[in-house]
């Protein structure tokens, strides 16, 4: 007789799961020198207890505790990018500026990005069936309250000037809901970071309005400066030649605004 | 090899603070952990807080909260530990040590700090 | 706070005998458990790290197993020069902590 199962509103563990994680670590390790020191076995240890045998409405951030300390790394604070919807260009943009780091560029972001994992309680099985939505099921699952986890230390790590890179062709250009707006903005730490600056990111070839002057830009900048924390704002008309220039900041038409 | 060197032994008063230093070599400094441990005499280990000299990052004893600053400094590779408002309890031997797999892998050779008045 | 408890908290062996020390977690701390050993007068040396790994150039009489909640270190046959305190430490959740320690004399 087949063992009733919980069945969740949202995707189920990504297929070889475990086997990705420590791949994942594998890769990073080598590519990153400073952290060939990271045994990649504790750090899928780690991983695993966080979430194996748990209640996957349960999960708090302690329980990702060993697992955030495994993979503690050097990030200069003073080259931090943040986005909020718009992941893939934050990602093309730190490939070609390398001296540049999202949280996906981490250890612990890399490890994890566009995966999905959960278990389930009492069990050391990894549900592949279905995992609980953010929002049907819960917000403590393995998912969120990971993310959750590594964004608010990734936030709390960044000084000088902070950049965060947001979507202007969403309704809520900055959304308070977001990881960004929910955790990262209210961890930034105002003795340490002098300034946000954000980068709207157009999406019409045409649109040539001021998106800094959005109202939820603005509320963005109220949050900012109560905190005591300067706010810039800056238009990427023109996301592709934005990226270009960055590739080739001596080319001509790079003088422009993009 | 890894070595850690710690200062030397201190007696202060109470309602004094100390630093003790913690000097690091045979490693890379900012790629691992430092923890700091007490132990009273005639006592057992007692964990005060950490810190990863690489990013900052600092975790606390709540115990010690408010008592208690790690500090490091990477052009040196030497670790801090300052504890404030002393008392006589706080009498004891403070270690130094490295973090691996969260235990503690090279020990400093301990600084003794006496609190008498 | 986990609470990290050792038995026994002391015990007299003769040279060659082997020893077994268990250190019980109030909750579960997976394989994140350290054993140390530590002399008078000296810092904690490193013995076993992550429940049953073995640490640089530690002998091999010294072995550890578990995971959850409970642990053993195990000396399978004592030396003169292993006469000390033996302490457990978890290393799941902060604050850190330690057994209270398992003092192994000569009999």
């Known amino acids: 007789v087949p063992r009733w199962r919980q069945q969740w509103s949202g995707p189920g563990t990504t297929k070889r799961f475990p086997e990705t994680v420590l791949a994942r670590c594998v890769k990073y390790t080598e590519i990153h020198p400073e952290m060939r020191h990271v045994d990649c076995q504790s750090v899928w240890d780690a991983f695993k207890g966080a979430f194996i045998s748990k209640h996957p409405c349960n999960i708090t951030e302690e329980d990702y505790q060993p697992l955030m300390k495994l993979g503690t790394q050097t990030v200069p604070c003073n080259k931090i990018l943040l986005w909020s919807r718009i992941k893939d260009l934050a990602h093309q943009f730190t490939q070609v500026q390398r001296d540049m780091f999202t949280l996906e560029d981490t250890l612990l972001g890399y490890l994890a990005d566009d995966l999905t994992w959960c278990g389930e309680f009492n069990t050391s099985k990894i549900n592949y069936q279905s995992c609980p939505d953010w929002r049907k099921d819960c917000s403590n699952n393995p998912v969120s309250v990971f993310w959750k986890t590594v964004s608010r230390r990734f936030a709390e790590a960044a000084c000088d000037v902070v950049h965060v890179m947001l979507n202007g062709s969403r309704s809520k250009i900055f959304d308070k809901n977001s990881t960004f707006g929910s955790v990262e903005v209210h961890n930034l730490q105002p003795e340490k970071v002098q300034t946000l600056e954000a980068w709207v990111i157009h999406g019409g070839r045409e649109d040539s309005r001021d998106l800094c002057q959005d109202p939820t830009i603005k509320e963005l900048e109220s949050i900012i400066s109560k905190r005591n924390i300067q706010f810039s704002c800056k238009n990427i008309y023109r996301p592709d030649k934005f990226l270009q220039c960055v590739k080739n900041p001596e080319d001509s038409s790079c003088t422009s605004e993009i | 090899q890894v070595q850690l060197v710690q200062s030397g032994a201190e007696v202060k008063k109470p309602g004094s603070s100390v630093k003790v230093s913690c000097k690091a070599s045979?490693?890379?400094?900012?790629?691992?952990?430092i923890e700091w441990v007490r132990q009273a005499p005639g006592q057992g280990l007692e964990w005060m807080g950490d810190?990863?000299?690489?990013?900052?990052?600092?975790d606390y004893n709540e115990k010690f909260k408010g008592r208690v600053t790690i500090t490091a400094d990477e052009s040196t590779s030497t670790a801090y530990m300052e504890l404030s408002s002393l008392r006589s309890e706080d009498t004891a031997v403070y270690y130094c040590?490295?973090?691996?797999?969260?235990?503690?892998?090279?020990w400093g050779q301990g600084t003794l700090v006496t609190v008498s008045s | 706070d986990i609470q990290m408890t050792q038995s026994p908290s002391s015990l007299s062996a003769s040279v060659g005998d082997r020893v077994t020390i268990t250190c019980h977690a109030s909750?579960?701390?997976?394989?994140?458990l350290g054993w140390y050993q530590q002399k008078p007068g000296k810092a904690p040396k490193l013995l076993i790290y992550?429940?049953?790994n073995l640490h640089t150039g530690v002998p091999s009489r010294f072995s550890g197993s578990g995971s959850g909640t409970d642990f053993t270190l195990t000396i399978s046959s004592l030396q003169p020069e292993d006469f000390a305190t033996y302490y457990c430490?978890?290393?799941?959740?902060?604050?850190?902590?330690f057994g209270q320690g398992t003092k192994v004399e000569i009999k």
């Open positions: 045979g490693y890379t400094f900012t790629n691992h952990w």
């Open positions: 430490q978890q290393g799941q959740s902060y604050p850190y902590t």
């Open positions: 040590a490295r973090g691996r797999d969260l235990a503690m892998d090279y």
């Open positions: 810190i990863f000299p690489g990013g900052g990052y600092t």
């Open positions: 909750q579960n701390i997976n394989v994140w």
């Open positions: 992550k429940a049953s």
